[in-house]
């Protein structure tokens, strides 16, 4: 069974600074990536990037930089001040879509004891679902 | 949980029409397009019909003239009729929702599918 990863990691440099980071684990070819904070995409949660493998990026504030690393991962450099600003427990949801097969989602958020900078490599996170 | 359900697929004569109905639950969309899709037996998918939040709307060259997309934002819903249908129309028809890149609508979520049946 195909499953996305997350990992979170606040930069050392600039506290208000995050990169989050997806994997999709699976066979397909991937459509879209989309990308959210606050909880999964259409159940809460606000859109910060949207990725086409062919067609492009769209990205919003504050997320300032979403690439793609392979044809299976993408970051996503979030950068706020304020009320835009994400802060160490917010949760962030990639899901990896291949239309027509299937689409997969998993969230994740900074580690509770994790120093800026830090991180553990990333590992598979729940699938929160597969459509 | 975002669920999209197609319904109005079946089998048609050729010439014969159908129309098709989408209903949206269980999420508040934040894409920008919704749209009809298509695969036909072993052939890639398709898009046939697309309308973004402004009211835009493109059709597939195939099916312009004959199948008409509109939506009704109060029921959640996105509709397709399918008028002189033709053989070559026969496929498996996808509601779908997601954002527009280039001008084209790229799905991030669909339904099951609907199968629709031209033949006489």
């Known amino acids: 069974t195909p499953e996305v990863w997350v990992q979170v990691r606040m930069e050392a440099t600039e506290l208000s600074s995050f990169t989050i980071r997806c994997g999709f684990l699976g066979s397909g070819s991937i459509s879209l990536v989309t990308v959210s904070w606050g909880g999964p995409n259409g159940a809460g949660g606000t859109t910060l990037a949207v990725l086409h493998p062919e067609r492009g990026i769209r990205q919003w504030a504050p997320a300032r930089q979403a690439r793609w690393e392979t044809q299976s991962s993408i970051s996503l450099i979030l950068e706020g001040s304020g009320a835009s600003s994400p802060c160490a427990n917010t949760t962030f949801c990639c899901k990896f879509a291949s239309f027509p097969e299937g689409s997969w989602e998993a969230c994740g958020s900074l580690p509770p004891s994790s120093d800026p900078g830090l991180s553990a490599p990333p590992t598979p996170a729940p699938i929160l679902r597969a459509d | 949980e975002v669920q999209l359900v197609e319904s109005g697929g079946g089998l048609v004569q050729p010439g014969g029409s159908l129309r098709l109905s989408c209903a949206a639950s269980?999420?508040?969309?934040?894409?920008?397009?919704m749209g009809w899709f298509r695969q036909a037996p072993g052939k890639g998918l398709e898009g046939v019909a697309t309308?973004?939040?402004?009211?835009?709307?493109k059709y597939a060259d195939s099916v312009k003239g004959r199948f008409t997309i509109s939506r009704d934002n109060a029921k959640n819903s996105l509709y397709l009729q399918m008028n002189s249908l033709r053989a070559e129309d026969t496929a498996v028809y996808y509601c779908?929702?997601?954002?527009?890149?280039?001008?084209?609508?790229?799905?991030?979520?669909w339904g099951q599918g609907t199968q629709v049946t031209v033949s006489s």
């Open positions: 779908a929702a997601g954002w527009t890149f280039g001008g084209q609508c790229s799905p991030a979520d």
């Open positions: 269980g999420f508040t969309f934040s894409g920008d397009c």
């Open positions: 309308i973004d939040n402004a009211g835009r709307i």
